[in-house]
């Protein structure tokens, strides 16, 4: 193949090599950028900055090598458009630091930074941690800080992410109330802070106030939907990011729904109850208190993490005709009580038939001595005859 005279030449099916001395001062308009998976750059003294716009359109890039060049600064968001990047080699440049944000969100298998005049500071605490934890092939590089010794020996006692304290109301909140939350941020080198309110949707009207180090958030005219929703305060400094999530308890009255009985392993009368605090429940059968047993009992499904409603079943183990009737679920909490009723028919009464009807001659036995509401276990499936004298 003829030698490539351009600044950058194809390499394999989806690679590009840019090695001609001083030919590049930015990575704009690289040929065939959309399909590139590998980009190799060397000897580019004028390439000093790597920024967000430089790698736009390189969405398929897996391997990026910029070596023996003049790179001094890599923007924290430089790799936003290259989410698939797995190997990054920036060795033998003029980098004094590299933000933790630069590699956040990437799944880097390899990060090479040797041969840079790194300056030991808290901003490289994340890299020191990678070295400690054996990530990205960093330990093998024995990284040095320029004139300061090994990165591994950098004191880090004062290198912490921000500390957050979120003040929430110390009592429950009612529907329609306004709630003031305050996020107090402490720490060195604070850069940014804010609230993440993605879960709130229509749960309240949101008003933000203040800034570092004290952020205010008013949730106005709150609804019951605010329960179990995370309100998150976040802050960043040169060491990293901290988040603290809180939830606001919004009280509201009990409510209840009952659904038609369904036959599963046991019979189930499905119900849903809601309310904050969680309501206490009581069952009535034909208007009288239903005492639960090992045959008839309430069972809750696993609750969803982000809602107050609880779903469950009144379980009935092999119910008979004596269990047919009206089931009522009573729910109560401090702010309201509710009830719902449903008729359930599990089995026809075999002893209620018209003398004109054909006489059944064979069926499974039922223990007629049972007077309790508890279901009866079938002990023997053998059919037997019945003689009925009709007067």
């Amino acid at each position: 193949a003829a030698p490539c005279p351009d600044a950058c030449c194809p390499h394999g099916s989806s690679g590009l090599r840019c090695t001609r001395d001083g030919a590049l001062d930015s990575l704009h308009h690289l040929p065939g950028a959309e399909n590139l998976t590998e980009l190799y750059i060397e000897n580019q003294q004028h390439l000093q900055h790597l920024e967000l716009r430089d790698l736009r359109g390189l969405g398929e890039l897996r391997n990026l090598t910029i070596v023996k060049s003049g790179l001094r600064f890599v923007a924290p968001d430089a790799f936003h458009f290259t989410p698939r990047l797995s190997r990054l080699n920036l060795s033998f440049n003029a980098l004094e630091s590299l933000s933790w944000k630069t590699v956040q969100g990437l799944s880097l298998q390899e990060l090479v930074l040797s041969g840079n005049p790194l300056h030991c500071s808290c901003a490289l605490r994340w890299l020191q941690r990678w070295e400690e934890e054996g990530l990205g092939g960093v330990p093998e590089q024995k990284l040095q800080c320029h004139g300061q010794g090994p990165l591994a020996h950098m004191p880090n006692a004062s290198c912490g992410v921000p500390t957050l304290k979120v003040q929430v109301p110390n009592a429950s909140v009612d529907v329609g109330d306004d709630v003031l939350l305050r996020c107090q941020v402490e720490g060195r080198g604070l850069e940014q802070a804010g609230w993440i309110l993605t879960e709130l949707e229509q749960s309240a009207t949101v008003m933000k106030s203040g800034g570092l180090p004290s952020l205010g958030l008013t949730l106005a005219n709150v609804t019951s939907d605010l329960n179990r929703k995370n309100v998150t305060c976040w802050a960043e400094n040169d060491v990293g990011r901290a988040e603290v999530s809180v939830q606001v308890n919004v009280s509201f009255p009990a409510s209840v729904q009952l659904h038609t009985a369904v036959e599963m392993h046991h019979w189930c009368i499905p119900f849903s109850v809601d309310g904050q605090p969680a309501p206490s429940l009581r069952w009535l059968f034909n208007g009288s208190v239903l005492n639960e047993t090992s045959f008839i009992f309430t069972e809750f499904l696993e609750p969803a993490a982000n809602e107050t409603v609880r779903h469950g079943c009144l379980r009935l183990n092999q119910p008979t005709h004596v269990n047919n009737g009206n089931y009522t679920l009573l729910a109560a909490n401090p702010f309201g009580q509710a009830s719902a009723s449903i008729m359930a028919a599990f089995m026809d009464n075999p002893f209620e038939f018209n003398p004109e009807d054909p006489i059944p001659v064979s069926f499974s036995p039922v223990d007629t001595n049972s007077t309790s509401g508890d279901p009866v276990e079938k002990k023997d499936e053998t059919p037997f005859g019945v003689s009925v004298a009709v007067g």
Epitope: A171, D177, P253, A332, P334
Partner: antibody
Framework: EVQLLESGGGLVQPGGSLRLSCAAS????????MSWVRQTPGKRLEWVAY????????YYPDTVKGRFTISRDNSKNTLYLQMNSLRAEDTAVYYC????????????????WGQGTTVTVSS | QIVLTQSPATLSLSPGERATLSCSAS?????MHWYQQKPGQSPRLLIY???NLASGIPSRFSGSGSGTDFTLTISSLEPEDAADYYC?????????FGGGTKLEIK
């Protein structure tokens, strides 16, 4: 010092109306729930109405629901109880009471009560 | 609604004696609160959420219980303890009070 001062009580005929007021001082009124509780001539205590801190939620027992309305004006530190369609059985001393705040708990009691105002419903 | 039944209706004891006042709920409740009312005065919070002493209340007062049975105990009676005592539940709507126990000091 927390102070709650009720006013507006008096003698009213059955079917009539009254509006009770409760002036609050000594605490940040807008950050506490408030309630009205009455005491019958037989000395029984009955909860009558509850209102949330901002006034967005109100609760009543069935005995007064639809007849009584609780409200508040946080700018004036004042709680109100509008009583309509009054009956003889509404005769009582009416207390306004401040909700307590003991941790993040729904079951807080009423920690301060006013001296009460007497409502007599009689023809 | 949850009915609170207090017993005894009247209790007559001497100073220094121990007083035990009971409150029984018709259904299980999470907590019980207790109030004291002296003649001509408004009720005053004594015990909140079953066993916590309200501000300014002497330590001779204590509360206990769970479920449906709750107790207010005064370990050593003082003459100023003569009053009506009410239990109160806020666990289940509507919020209710007991009928009261009248404590007399001989």
């Amino acid at each position: 010092e927390v102070q709650l001062l009720e006013s507006g009580g008096g003698l009213v005929q059955p079917g009539g109306s009254l509006r009770l007021s409760c002036a609050a001082s000594g605490f940040t009124f807008s950050t506490y729930t408030m309630s009205w509780v009455r005491q019958t001539p037989g000395k029984r205590l009955e909860w009558v109405a509850y209102i949330s801190k901002g006034g967005g939620s109100t609760y009543y027992p069935d005995t007064v629901k639809g007849r009584f309305t609780i409200s508040r004006d946080n700018s004036k530190n004042t709680l109100y109880l509008q009583m309509n369609s009054l009956r003889a059985e509404d005769t009582a001393v009416y207390y306004c009471a401040k909700g307590a705040m003991y941790g993040n708990d729904f079951f807080y009691p009423m920690d301060y009560w006013g001296q009460g105002t007497t409502v007599t419903v009689s023809s | 609604q949850i009915v609170l039944t207090q017993s005894p209706a009247t209790l007559s004891l001497s100073p220094g004696e121990r007083a035990t006042l009971s409150c029984s709920a018709s259904s299980s409740v999470s907590y019980m609160h207790w109030y004291q009312q002296k003649p001509g005065q408004s009720p005053r919070l004594l015990i909140y959420t079953t066993s916590n002493l309200a501000s300014g209340i002497p330590s001779r007062f204590s509360g206990s219980g769970s479920g449906t049975d709750f107790t207010l105990t005064i370990s050593s009676l003082e003459p100023e303890d003569a009053a009506d005592y009410y239990c109160h539940q806020w666990s289940s709507y509507p919020w209710t009070f007991g009928g009261g126990t009248k404590l007399e000091i001989k």
